[in-house]
């Protein structure tokens, strides 16, 4: 697992729509795999955080005066969709094949 | 200034490319503006913030779970470029007018 | 070691024309800016004109003082760039250098040739 | 266009000592955070040589007595310590705005 410690990376966070109160318009699935992005930003940021210049500048900048600036963050960079069947303003069953920006498909630090 | 306490929003973050170690081949500007985006992604997310579906479901799981899920992070959403000159490789100062991704335009929750 | 070399001046009538070209070696040309300037005798320099890049699509730009009359082309095959001067008149006397540089500076200079307008 | 002046037209100044030319542009020659200003040295029968740009740089193979500052407006060359070598025409220069245009030369020589 991706602990503060350890480098940016897409871990797996298990979305119960119930938890979230969304089970009232969502019907199925119950759950997704939404993950999550975690961990540090640290220098050198690797390639495979693709690293905009802005947060190469923002983590050399927290190198030299680390209580001023933040790092950069871990984020989603690529999102995907999940299909979902949910009730339309009718009460009616509809399926949405892509319901986007749901699931974390790549990291970066930004 | 957005201390840890306010909402996600850009702040200003002065960069002196001495400071990084760029002025090495960057020779002006001497410093410039690539501001910083600052501050917590709290529940409910403001539209200001463009949050994706996915940073909106990460706060509502953070809400219920708070340890076991971070929240969304703000994030540099936009960037925009500046102007800088440097040395080619036959040392002649050459103009770039657009050294794109160096300044924070935008930020928002991800 | 970065050359540019132009081709002999000379004496022209007023209203005449002549080609000045100028031969560059020891950096890659298709990479930089080329220029004209000129020198009147004993006077100061003068920008005349300069031709940009392939992916500028070779824009050119002049003085005001010689536009429509002169014009800067290059051919990049030959590392080379010419200035056509018409109409020439007896101001444009001077000594003219060839340039290379960026969008930022004239880095490179030729020796210069003289161009004498006079009848 | 952008007239650069100079001054003053000519300077005689002693061996080892300073030499401060000076350039004013008539509208401010920055931008970007960036001085669009050029300092050119001319020695008799030769062609001009890059000797400061962007205000402040020494040009390549450039000594360390030849300083360039400044900025907007007003910018200066200092030659210190003055050495024979150093008798030449001075210009400024600016590429904010085309047509690029020069100063119209400080002769410098020693007294």
């Known amino acids: 697992s991706a602990g503060a410690g350890s480098h940016c990376q897409k871990t797996s966070l298990r979305v119960n729509f119930e938890d979230i109160g969304w089970d009232s318009w969502i019907i199925a699935p119950k759950e997704y795999e939404a993950y999550e992005c975690k961990g540090g930003c640290f220098f050198p940021l690797a390639d495979d955080v693709t690293p905009t210049k802005h947060a190469i500048v923002q983590t050399l900048v927290h190198l030299k005066f680390p209580t001023k600036v933040g790092k950069a963050c871990c984020v989603p960079t690529k999102l995907s969709p999940i299909s979902v069947l949910y009730k339309d303003d009718m009460g009616v069953p509809t399926l949405k094949y892509h319901y986007e920006g749901m699931s974390v498909a790549e990291c970066g630090c930004r | 200034s957005a201390g840890a306490g306010s909402h996600c929003q850009k702040t200003s973050l002065r960069v002196n490319f001495e400071d990084i170690g760029w002025d090495s081949w960057i020779i002006a500007p001497k410093e410039y503006e690539a501001y910083e985006c600052k501050g917590g992604c709290f529940f409910p997310l403001a539209d200001d913030v463009t949050p994706t579906k996915h940073a909106i479901v990460q706060t509502l799981v953070h809400l219920k779970f708070p340890t076991k899920v971070g929240k969304a992070c703000c994030v540099p959403t936009k960037l925009s470029p500046i102007s800088v000159l440097y040395k080619d490789d036959m040392g002649v100062p050459t103009l770039k007018y657009h050294y794109e991704g160096m300044s924070v335009a935008e930020c928002g929750c991800r | 070691e970065v050359q540019l070399v132009e081709s002999r001046g000379g004496l022209v009538q007023p209203g005449g024309s002549m080609r000045l070209s100028c031969a560059a070696s020891?950096?890659?040309?298709?990479?930089?800016?080329m220029n004209w300037v000129r020198q009147a005798p004993g006077k100061g320099l003068e920008w005349v004109a300069h031709i940009r890049l392939k992916s500028d699509n070779y824009a050119t730009h002049y003085a005001e003082s010689v536009r429509g009359r002169f014009t800067i082309s290059r051919d990049d095959s030959k590392s080379s760039v010419y200035l056509q001067m018409n109409s020439l008149k007896t101001e444009d006397t001077g000594i003219y250098y060839c340039?290379?540089?960026?969008?930022?500076?004239?880095?490179?200079w030729g020796q210069g040739t003289l161009v004498t307008v006079s009848s | 266009d952008i007239v650069m002046t100079q001054s003053p037209d000519s300077l005689a100044v002693s061996l080892g000592e300073r030499a401060t030319i000076n350039c004013r542009a008539s509208e401010s020659v920055d931008n970007y955070g960036i001085s669009f200003m050029n300092w050119f040295q001319q020695k008799p029968g030769q062609p001009p040589k890059l000797l400061i740009y962007a205000a402040s740089n020494q040009g390549s193979g450039v000594p360390d007595r030849f300083s360039g500052s400044g900025s907007g407006t007003d910018f200066t060359l200092t030659i210190s310590p003055l050495q024979a070598e150093d008798v030449a025409v001075y210009f400024c220069?600016?590429?904010?705005?085309?047509?690029?245009?020069f100063g119209q030369g400080t002769k410098l020589e020693i007294k």
């Open positions: 340039t290379g540089g960026s969008n930022y500076v004239f880095a490179f």
């Open positions: 020891g950096f890659t040309f298709s990479n930089y800016w």
């Open positions: 220069q600016q590429s904010k705005e085309v047509p690029w245009t």
